[in-house]
Interface confidence: medium
């Protein structure tokens, strides 16, 4: 229970891609404001997004401190203009979020094909190693730095002149595939974490085709 002019937040939802992590909730505030707290299972609560009229709060800075921890957030509701006011139990209304483990649950962002290079009947396709907001020693880590061997990429490739797709996998950011001489190919990649049970795959990258600027052709 709380004061009659505040309602508890609901539909608390984690939105996270490549560790950029935002907590969203409802409703849009009417004569009330929100404050968010976040904690690890064993840690202290830390307040964020003080007395906001937004219905989202960027918690990236907190979760990137340890992406393998499990986090819980809660959203407090206060009457607008009277944030000291509390509910009848002496506490402002609040609602808990679901638990969130970034390493296991953050969505894999859409990958990008950085380049492809043809040498005779081989093509080397390179996937851009996306930077994340996870830091180590004041340096931002790439997706590969964070996930290591758990992250693989799937390549889909096909002749420009046909629709039959072939596939390849790599646990680096590079593919080396065989192609037919004189044929143009198109490529798309997908990031995958096979050991996950949820959010295993990214969306497919934009398609890149040979004969466009991104690639390079060398006849050997």
């Amino acid at each position: 229970s709380g004061t009659t002019n505040t309602v508890a937040a609901y539909n608390l939802t984690w939105k996270s891609t490549n560790f950029k992590t935002i907590l969203e909730w409802e409703p849009k505030p009417v004569n009330q404001v929100y404050t968010v707290q976040i904690s690890t299972k064993s840690g202290d609560w830390k307040s964020k997004c003080f007395y906001t009229t937004d219905t989202e709060c960027d918690l990236t800075d907190e979760i990137v401190k340890d992406v393998k921890q499990t986090y819980l957030a809660r959203v407090f509701s206060y009457p607008a203009g009277n944030v000291e006011s509390t509910g009848s139990a002496g506490e402002p209304l609040y609602e808990n979020s679901p638990e969130f483990t970034p390493y296991l649950e953050t969505n894999l962002g859409q990958p990008t094909i950085q380049s492809f290079e043809q040498v005779g009947t081989k093509v080397n396709v390179t996937v851009e190693d996306e930077r994340t907001l996870v830091r180590r020693n004041n340096t931002f880590l790439s997706l590969r730095d964070v996930f290591g061997k758990d992250l693989i990429y799937t390549l889909y490739y096909w002749k420009s002149s046909s629709s039959g797709k072939k596939t390849a996998k790599t646990n680096t950011n590079e593919f080396l595939i065989d192609v037919d001489k004189g044929e143009n190919y198109c490529f798309s990649v997908q990031a995958v974490i096979p050991s996950r049970t949820v959010n295993r795959k990214s969306t497919d990258s934009p398609v890149e085709c040979m004969g466009q600027e991104k690639g390079e052709f060398r006849e050997i």
Epitope: K149, K166, T167, A168, K169, S195
Partner: antibody
Framework: EVQLVQSGAEVKKPGESLKISCKGS????????IGWVRQMPGKGLEWMGI????????RYSPSFQGQVTISADKSISTAYLQWSSLKASDTAMYYC??????????????WGQGTMVTVSS | DIQMTQSPSSLSASVGDRVTITCRAS??????LAWYQQKPEKAPKSLIY???SLQSGVPSRFSGSGSGTDFTLTISSLQPEDFATYYC?????????FGQGTTVEVK
């Protein structure tokens, strides 16, 4: 030459413990997953689990979780499969095999010769 | 777990025959299928990965095709050393699972 060499055949009694080994050579042992596959007499192949020797990360098939332990000693390029208490139904040929691209999510390319384990009273 | 069903369970063929073995997955596995050959009292040998890619050193008479749920291993001209049991394996989802095997016998 890339190869996996397994320890020799074992004959054990029910309730005894056992640890069989698989030694890799000719490639970077720490950067490829090693799997274990069971083949019971006259039957097909069953995937048991895998280990990444670089950090001993392990993944088990639900059918074998808690029944066996997979481990590795990267200093001697050796993976292990062990039982704390054998049963007659553990009688089988056990193969180790390497995942082709060093991924946990891949086909096997190199196989050990197999270790026959017989459990009988 | 994904079920892999091979057919036939066994077949009789002669040297020079074209042999086809099929493997069906209980759900889509993209192209993440491997084929292995096993001779009596020997370890399995890897033949094909990613449904159609030949392992290094495997003769070109072996070929694989298929995507999704239906896959085929073809031996274009059976040789004496090809009489063996063949297994398919999916590695799209945990745990990877094998088919029950197809034994190619001498007719």
């Amino acid at each position: 030459e890339v190869q996996l060499v397994q320890s020799g055949a074992e004959v054990k009694k029910p309730g005894e413990s056992l640890k069989i080994s698989c030694k890799g050579s000719g490639y970077s042992f720490t950067s490829c997953w090693i799997g274990w596959v069971r083949q019971m007499p006259g039957k097909g192949l069953e995937w048991m689990g895998i280990i990444y020797p670089g950090d001993s990360d392990t993944r088990y098939s639900p059918s074998f979780q808690g029944q066996v332990t997979i481990s590795a000693d990267k200093s001697i390029s050796t993976a292990y499969l062990q039982w704390s208490s054998l049963k007659a139904s553990d009688t089988a040929m056990y193969y180790c095999a390497r995942h082709k691209l060093g991924m946990d999510h891949d086909a096997f390319d190199i196989w050990g010769q197999g270790t026959m384990v017989t459990v009988s009273s | 777990d994904i079920q892999m069903t091979q057919s036939p369970s066994s077949l009789s063929a002669s040297v020079g025959d074209r042999v086809t073995i099929t493997c069906r997955a209980s759900q889509g596995i993209s192209s993440w299928l491997a084929w292995y050959q096993q001779k009596p009292e020997k370890a399995p040998k890897s033949l094909i990965y990613a449904a159609s890619s030949l392992q290094s050193g495997v003769p070109s008479r072996f070929s694989g095709s298929g995507s999704g749920t239906d896959f085929t291993l073809t031996i274009s001209s059976l040789q004496p050393e090809d009489f063996a049991t063949y297994y398919c394996q999916q590695y799209n989802s945990y745990p990877p699972t094998f088919g029950q095997g197809t034994t190619v016998e001498v007719k």
